[in-house]
Protein backbone atom coordinates (compact mmCIF):
# COMPACT_ATOMS: atom_id res chain seq x y z
CA UNK A 1 0.00 0.00 0.00
CA UNK A 2 1.30 3.51 -0.78
CA UNK A 3 2.26 5.57 2.23
CA UNK A 4 -0.02 8.61 1.96
CA UNK A 5 1.62 10.27 4.95
CA UNK A 6 4.92 10.53 3.14
CA UNK A 7 3.49 11.33 -0.29
CA UNK A 8 5.42 14.17 -1.95
CA UNK A 9 3.71 17.56 -2.05
CA UNK A 10 4.04 19.79 -5.10
CA UNK A 11 4.29 23.48 -4.24
CA UNK A 12 4.75 26.65 -6.26
CA UNK A 13 7.27 29.18 -4.96
CA UNK A 14 7.26 31.55 -7.94
CA UNK A 15 4.57 32.51 -10.43
CA UNK A 16 4.77 33.25 -14.11
CA UNK A 17 4.79 36.97 -14.82
CA UNK A 18 3.43 36.48 -18.34
CA UNK A 19 -0.18 35.98 -19.33
CA UNK A 20 -0.56 32.69 -21.22
CA UNK A 21 -3.01 32.38 -24.11
CA UNK A 22 -5.85 29.97 -23.31
CA UNK A 23 -5.22 28.30 -26.67
CA UNK A 24 -1.91 27.07 -25.23
CA UNK A 25 -3.50 25.59 -22.11
CA UNK A 26 -4.68 21.99 -21.79
CA UNK A 27 -5.61 21.68 -18.12
CA UNK A 28 -5.01 22.96 -14.61
CA UNK A 29 -4.81 21.70 -11.06
CA UNK A 30 -5.00 23.59 -7.80
CA UNK A 31 -2.41 23.43 -5.06
CA UNK A 32 -4.51 23.18 -1.92
CA UNK A 33 -2.03 21.68 0.52
CA UNK A 34 -1.51 23.65 3.72
CA UNK A 35 2.14 22.57 3.51
CA UNK A 36 2.67 24.98 0.60
CA UNK A 37 3.49 28.64 1.28
CA UNK A 38 1.19 30.04 -1.42
CA UNK A 39 -2.16 29.36 -3.02
CA UNK A 40 -1.34 28.35 -6.56
CA UNK A 41 -2.59 27.01 -9.87
CA UNK A 42 -0.50 24.75 -12.08
CA UNK A 43 -1.41 25.01 -15.73
CA UNK A 44 -0.37 22.27 -18.10
CA UNK A 45 0.19 23.48 -21.65
CA UNK A 46 -0.59 21.60 -24.85
CA UNK A 47 3.10 20.66 -25.02
CA UNK A 48 2.89 19.23 -21.46
CA UNK A 49 4.87 22.05 -19.81
CA UNK A 50 3.72 22.89 -16.27
CA UNK A 51 3.52 26.53 -15.23
CA UNK A 52 2.77 27.96 -11.79
CA UNK A 53 0.32 30.86 -11.76
CA UNK A 54 -1.22 33.16 -9.17
CA UNK A 55 -4.96 32.41 -8.64
CA UNK A 56 -5.51 35.99 -7.50
CA UNK A 57 -4.85 37.25 -11.04
CA UNK A 58 -7.87 37.83 -13.26
CA UNK A 59 -6.35 36.16 -16.33
CA UNK A 60 -5.69 33.02 -14.27
CA UNK A 61 -9.30 32.94 -13.05
CA UNK A 62 -10.59 33.50 -16.58
CA UNK A 63 -8.35 30.73 -17.90
CA UNK A 64 -9.66 28.30 -15.28
CA UNK A 65 -13.23 29.25 -16.25
CA UNK A 66 -12.41 28.56 -19.90
CA UNK A 67 -10.88 25.15 -19.12
CA UNK A 68 -13.76 24.21 -16.82
CA UNK A 69 -16.28 24.97 -19.56
CA UNK A 70 -14.45 22.61 -21.90
CA UNK A 71 -15.16 19.72 -19.49
CA UNK A 72 -18.91 20.40 -19.47
CA UNK A 73 -21.06 17.46 -20.48
CA UNK A 74 -24.87 17.80 -20.57
CA UNK A 75 -25.62 15.01 -18.12
CA UNK A 76 -28.15 16.80 -15.92
Amino acid sequence: QPDAINAPVTCCYNFTNRKISVQRLASYRRITSSKCPKEAVIFKTIVAKEICADPKQKWVQDSMDHLDKQTQTPKT
Epitope: Y28, R30, P55, K56, D62, M64, D68, K69, K75
Partner: nanobody, 123 residues
Framework: EMQLVESGGGLVQAGGSLRLSCAAS????????MGWFRQAPEKEREFVAL????????FYSNSVKGRFTISRDNAKNTVYLQMNSLKPEDTAVYYC????????????????WGQGTQVTVSS
Protein backbone atom coordinates in the same frame (compact mmCIF):
# COMPACT_ATOMS: atom_id res chain seq x y z
CA GLU B 1 -8.14 25.92 4.14
CA MET B 2 -11.37 27.42 2.89
CA GLN B 3 -14.32 27.64 5.25
CA LEU B 4 -17.88 27.72 3.90
CA VAL B 5 -20.90 28.56 6.05
CA GLU B 6 -24.43 28.24 4.67
CA SER B 7 -27.49 30.07 6.01
CA GLY B 8 -31.05 30.87 4.99
CA GLY B 9 -32.63 27.44 5.18
CA GLY B 10 -35.93 26.78 6.90
CA LEU B 11 -39.51 25.58 6.60
CA VAL B 12 -41.60 26.99 3.77
CA GLN B 13 -44.90 26.12 2.12
CA ALA B 14 -45.03 24.77 -1.42
CA GLY B 15 -44.90 27.62 -3.90
CA GLY B 16 -42.87 29.77 -1.53
CA SER B 17 -39.34 31.14 -1.77
CA LEU B 18 -36.08 31.00 0.15
CA ARG B 19 -32.68 32.57 -0.40
CA LEU B 20 -29.66 30.60 0.72
CA SER B 21 -26.32 32.28 1.35
CA CYS B 22 -22.85 30.80 1.62
CA ALA B 23 -20.08 32.89 3.17
CA ALA B 24 -16.51 31.90 2.36
CA SER B 25 -13.28 32.66 4.16
CA UNK B 26 -9.67 31.52 4.22
CA UNK B 27 -8.90 31.49 0.49
CA UNK B 28 -9.20 33.70 -2.59
CA UNK B 29 -12.94 33.35 -3.17
CA UNK B 30 -12.90 34.76 -6.71
CA UNK B 31 -10.57 31.96 -7.83
CA UNK B 32 -13.10 29.18 -7.16
CA UNK B 33 -16.02 27.85 -9.15
CA MET B 34 -18.91 27.69 -6.69
CA GLY B 35 -21.71 25.18 -6.57
CA TRP B 36 -24.78 24.13 -4.65
CA PHE B 37 -25.62 20.48 -4.06
CA ARG B 38 -28.40 18.86 -2.06
CA GLN B 39 -29.10 15.59 -0.31
CA ALA B 40 -32.55 14.36 0.59
CA PRO B 41 -33.08 11.60 3.17
CA GLU B 42 -32.23 8.15 1.79
CA LYS B 43 -31.01 9.70 -1.46
CA GLU B 44 -27.64 10.44 -3.01
CA ARG B 45 -26.17 13.91 -3.04
CA GLU B 46 -27.15 15.69 -6.25
CA PHE B 47 -25.91 18.70 -8.13
CA VAL B 48 -28.20 21.75 -8.09
CA ALA B 49 -26.40 24.73 -9.62
CA LEU B 50 -22.98 26.24 -10.25
CA UNK B 51 -21.51 29.60 -11.12
CA UNK B 52 -18.10 30.28 -12.62
CA UNK B 53 -15.48 32.57 -11.13
CA UNK B 54 -16.47 35.71 -13.00
CA UNK B 55 -20.16 35.13 -12.31
CA UNK B 56 -20.87 35.29 -16.02
CA UNK B 57 -21.82 31.65 -16.49
CA UNK B 58 -24.38 29.63 -14.54
CA PHE B 59 -25.51 26.03 -14.93
CA TYR B 60 -28.51 24.26 -13.39
CA SER B 61 -29.85 20.75 -13.02
CA ASN B 62 -33.01 20.14 -15.01
CA SER B 63 -34.99 19.70 -11.80
CA VAL B 64 -34.45 23.32 -10.69
CA LYS B 65 -33.98 25.16 -14.00
CA GLY B 66 -36.29 28.16 -14.27
CA ARG B 67 -37.03 28.16 -10.53
CA PHE B 68 -33.61 28.58 -8.89
CA THR B 69 -31.02 31.29 -9.54
CA ILE B 70 -27.38 31.16 -8.44
CA SER B 71 -25.35 34.34 -8.06
CA ARG B 72 -22.18 35.50 -6.35
CA ASP B 73 -20.67 38.64 -4.90
CA ASN B 74 -16.88 38.38 -5.05
CA ALA B 75 -16.50 41.56 -2.99
CA LYS B 76 -18.46 39.94 -0.14
CA ASN B 77 -17.03 36.42 -0.61
CA THR B 78 -20.57 35.08 -0.81
CA VAL B 79 -22.58 32.88 -3.16
CA TYR B 80 -26.38 32.83 -3.17
CA LEU B 81 -29.14 30.47 -4.24
CA GLN B 82 -32.52 32.09 -4.80
CA MET B 83 -35.16 29.36 -4.72
CA ASN B 84 -38.64 30.17 -6.04
CA SER B 85 -41.75 28.06 -6.66
CA LEU B 86 -40.49 25.52 -4.14
CA LYS B 87 -41.88 21.99 -4.24
CA PRO B 88 -42.00 19.27 -1.55
CA GLU B 89 -39.42 17.33 -3.58
CA ASP B 90 -36.95 20.20 -3.03
CA THR B 91 -36.78 19.18 0.64
CA ALA B 92 -33.14 18.37 1.43
CA VAL B 93 -29.98 19.55 3.12
CA TYR B 94 -28.33 22.08 0.80
CA TYR B 95 -24.56 22.25 0.62
CA CYS B 96 -22.34 24.96 -0.76
CA UNK B 97 -19.06 23.83 -2.33
CA UNK B 98 -15.96 25.43 -3.82
CA UNK B 99 -14.60 23.88 -7.00
CA UNK B 100 -10.84 23.83 -6.81
CA UNK B 101 -10.09 21.26 -9.49
CA UNK B 102 -10.80 21.37 -13.21
CA UNK B 103 -14.35 20.27 -13.93
CA UNK B 104 -17.94 21.36 -13.98
CA UNK B 105 -20.80 19.79 -12.02
CA UNK B 106 -18.98 16.70 -10.71
CA UNK B 107 -18.90 16.65 -6.91
CA UNK B 108 -15.41 15.14 -6.96
CA UNK B 109 -13.97 18.39 -8.40
CA UNK B 110 -15.17 20.40 -5.38
CA UNK B 111 -12.55 20.38 -2.62
CA UNK B 112 -14.27 22.45 0.04
CA TRP B 113 -17.75 21.88 1.48
CA GLY B 114 -19.99 23.62 3.99
CA GLN B 115 -21.90 21.86 6.73
CA GLY B 116 -25.24 22.31 4.98
CA THR B 117 -28.54 24.04 5.71
CA GLN B 118 -31.89 22.25 5.93
CA VAL B 119 -34.67 23.24 3.55
CA THR B 120 -38.11 21.74 4.20
CA VAL B 121 -41.02 22.36 1.83
CA SER B 122 -44.43 21.39 3.17
CA SER B 123 -47.44 20.67 1.01
Amino acid sequence: EMQLVESGGGLVQAGGSLRLSCAASGRTFSSYRMGWFRQAPEKEREFVALINRSGGSQFYSNSVKGRFTISRDNAKNTVYLQMNSLKPEDTAVYYCAAGAQMGWAEASTYDYWGQGTQVTVSS
